[in-house]
């Protein structure tokens, strides 16, 4: 299971698609900017065994997939780009699930670092709450799109650290 290689490629494709999804100029939404307090420490590969890194990455992508699979999201984005982006996320989820089965050493270690998983979930709860408070406005979605690009970049960095561990 060459997780770091396949996942980084998938992540890059997802980032490109998410970049293409932008509909309005970020400069017109400067007043809507918000600090979602991304849990950066959860993307520090040094503190994780590979199994736990896999589950944190999966959590990140699953929560992103959940966010972009809502009816409100469907109304906000161009459908074919949204579908391609979602398909890319789904493929990454499948790859990560398969890695748990294939990766030597994952079996012996716990998959869960509960604090890390909860930190990622709370981060996405803050994003969802922001969208609700801003009534899913175009600028709110633009701010969220930029934030998810940032979080996907962090997850790519975690991948690179994992590759160095290999």
């Amino acid at each position: 299971c060459d997780l770091p290689q396949t996942h980084s490629l998938g992540n890059r494709r997802a980032l490109i698609l998410l970049g293409q999804m932008g509909r309005i100029s970020p400069f017109s939404c400067l007043k809507d900017r918000h600090d979602f307090r991304i849990p950066q420490e959860e993307f520090d590969g040094n503190q994780f065994q590979k199994a736990q890194a896999i589950s944190v990455l999966h959590e990140m992508i699953q929560q992103t997939f959940n966010l972009f699979s809502t009816e409100d999201s469907s109304a906000a984005w161009e459908q074919s780009l949204l579908e391609k982006f979602s398909t890319e996320l789904y493929q990454q989820l499948n790859d990560l699930e398969a890695c748990v089965i294939q990766e030597v050493g994952v079996e012996e270690t716990p998959l869960m670092n509960e604090d890390s998983i909860l930190a990622v979930r709370k981060y996405f709860q803050r994003i969802t709450l922001y969208l609700i408070e801003r009534k899913y406005s175009p600028c709110a979605w633009e701010v969220v799109r930029a934030e998810i690009m940032r979080s996907l970049s962090f997850s790519t960095n975690l991948q690179k650290r994992l590759r160095r561990k290999d």
């Epitope: 589950s55 959590e59 699979s69 998983i117």
Partner: antibody
């Protein structure tokens, strides 16, 4: 909490088709798969296939390929099972089942069935 | 394709006794992807244990799961009257996604 409500019992002739529906309510996500699992009278559980409603992606068990079709609507979140060329041995209770978004970590969520419908009895009889 | 074989087929025990149910896989299964369910007559299955050993919400601590590789166990430390049912193990494999059930073990009152 997710509630899954299936359509009522059906009696079908051999060779015909049946369509069973499963409506999800509560804390539902179209980004988690909905599966169909059947149980013949006095027998064990058998996974038939699943659908990811967000994308319409399906996966079918080898045993059913060629005569099973699973579809879904996203709003209201509903999954459908269609089984064709029915045989007497298809007489069973058909359950829809889904994972839980609350399972920690989420990587385990799609590997299990946390929520089950009440079951829909399909009887194949001449 | 993975085959899960549960044993024994039937277990006759009295309330208060302990029970150990076995689930053997035809090839290695990730313990993270091994799940146990309980099913009572006329009811839908209920999630008991996931990830090999994590109890689902509301499941009493008398239920525990263990094992790895090809051999897994569900242990009930002290049987309560409401525990008598059929128990199924289930594995997940990907890609493509495949869910496999064991044939079940019936725990009945002696």
């Amino acid at each position: 909490e997710v509630q899954l409500l299936e359509s009522g019992a059906e009696v079908k002739r051999p060779g015909s088709s049946v369509r069973v529906s499963c409506r999800a309510s509560g804390d539902t996500f179209s980004s988690y798969p909905i599966s169909w699992v059947r149980q013949a009278p006095g027998q064990g559980l058998e996974w038939m296939g699943r659908i990811l409603p967000a994308l319409g992606v399906t996966n079918y068990a080898q045993n059913f390929r060629g005569r099973i079709t699973i579809t879904a609507d996203k709003s209201p979140l509903t999954a459908y099972l269609e089984l064709s060329s029915l045989r007497f041995e298809d007489t069973a209770v058909y359950y829809c089942a889904s994972p839980s978004a609350d399972i920690i970590p989420s990587i385990l969520g799609t590997t299990l069935f946390a929520f089950w419908g009440q079951g829909s009895l399909v009887t194949v009889s001449s | 394709e993975i085959v899960l074989t549960q044993s024994p087929g039937t277990l006759s025990l009295s309330p208060g006794e302990g029970a150990t149910l076995s689930c053997r896989a035809s090839q290695n299964v990730s313990r993270h992807y091994l799940t146990w369910y309980q099913q009572k007559p006329g009811q839908s299955p209920r999630l008991l244990i996931y990830g090999g050993s994590s109890r689902a919400t509301g499941v009493p601590d008398r239920f525990s799961g263990g094992g790895s590789g090809t051999d897994f166990t569900l242990t009930i430390s002290r049987l309560e009257p409401e525990d008598f049912a059929v128990f199924y193990c289930q594995s997940y494999h990907s890609p493509p996604p495949v869910y496999t059930f064991g044939q079940g073990t019936k725990v009945e009152i002696k």
